[in-house]
Interface confidence: medium
Amino acid sequence: CCSCQEKWVGYRCNCYFISSEQKTWNESRHLCASQKSSLLQLQNTDELDFMSSSQQFYWIGLSYSEEHTAWLWENGSALSQYLFPSFETFNTKNCIAYNPNGNALDESCEDKNRYICKQQLI
Amino acid sequence: CGHCPEEWITYSNSCYYIGKERRTWEESLLACTSKNSSLLSIDNEEEMKFLSIISPSSWIGVFRNSSHHPWVTMNGLAFKHEIKDSDNAELNCAVLQVNRLKSAQCGSSIIYHCKHKL
């Protein structure tokens, strides 16, 4: 079920682009969109266990919606309260960077981080 | 996915088993053989950079018989790239460590990865 484009990683029927270049959250979002993908939306914290020993943090597709007063993924679905137990302490003006060992932190969206794009192959 | 075993990753026409267990170099070699694959070989610099993003450290299929012998790959070819700490006579197996190739004691317990080409 997996046939990923060049430079993308295939794992469990998803394709991931793992950047080594640092971008702002918005720049990262646009770069993923230009590759017909979106910033990483996590199903669970094991999703990237193939790189769980990485020490880097990566922008993911999570942002705070004032309208819904909730953290939402790019597709509009809400963040599960079980994914990041510390999410209530996140500054709602910030964006979320994720480390594949399961940690997340909030940072200014204008900060530059690496990013991960995801394409689902069904 | 595709032609790779379940729980392996695909990248650039190869399948990779990203191990989390630590083994000696020789144990890693045997573990990969049992998975019908080879201990991680790095064919080019771009592959090395990719693997360094995925995993900070792992054994690679490069070794030497002693510090007086050249570094060779599993198919017996000379390995021409710089391997750090090569002047230490006790370090005769090679490790990928965050974009670097280093020598290490073959009996050390280090994470291993396996690879096979599609």
Epitope: K7, S20, E21, Q22 | E45, K84
Partner: antibody, heavy 118, light 107 residues
Framework: EVQLVESGGGLVKPGGSLRLSCAAS????????MNWVRQAPGKGLEWVSA????????YYADSVKGRFTISRDNAKNSLYLQMNSLRAEDTAVYYC???????????WGQGTLVTVSS | AIQLTQSPSSLSASVGDRVTITCRAS??????LAWYQQKPGKAPKLLIY???SLKSGVPSRFSGSGSGTDFTLTISSLQPEDFATYYC?????????FGQGTRLEIK
Amino acid sequence: EVQLVESGGGLVKPGGSLRLSCAASGFTFSSHSMNWVRQAPGKGLEWVSAISSSSSYIYYADSVKGRFTISRDNAKNSLYLQMNSLRAEDTAVYYCAREEWGLPFDYWGQGTLVTVSS
Amino acid sequence: AIQLTQSPSSLSASVGDRVTITCRASQGISSALAWYQQKPGKAPKLLIYDASSLKSGVPSRFSGSGSGTDFTLTISSLQPEDFATYYCQQFNSYPLTFGQGTRLEIK
């Protein structure tokens, strides 16, 4: 002996274009990432652009993105930097530099001076 | 981009002195730091990579240390040929960045 020789620098008007070349010898050019680094008169070093061994990965500094294009011809052992829409602040000595499989810049050329002035 | 701040910007020292130059990164870069020496009119020369690994052929009086955000280049006993400008560089992620340089002058 590793050698990198830059050429193509000179005086150009703002808005103009220039193409720098870097001729490599003494090593397997196609195995190495290459970079351009510049240094404005009396100032520090500024990284400009990088290209991986097979041109799969290309990176630019924000200050040149959209104006400069890095490329390479492995058959000719040559690295290039196409510079368009040049500005006064692009005035600098431009160096090409080699990476050794993820090591930082272990060999540099002697540099070529680019002057952007009306 | 990751910013590197070197200190001091310049320093005067004598032959035989022990000299230390520091480099601070705006975010953690593990040990992905290099040090270069540059003399007027010449290309930079790699001294240290991986924060503490000495490039072959570089005199052992040069040493590097540090990890994360704080790094140090030490010259244990200055020689006349060591008077130059020194730069740190991070290669943890793109864009690659250099420190602003430290000019080492004869006292």
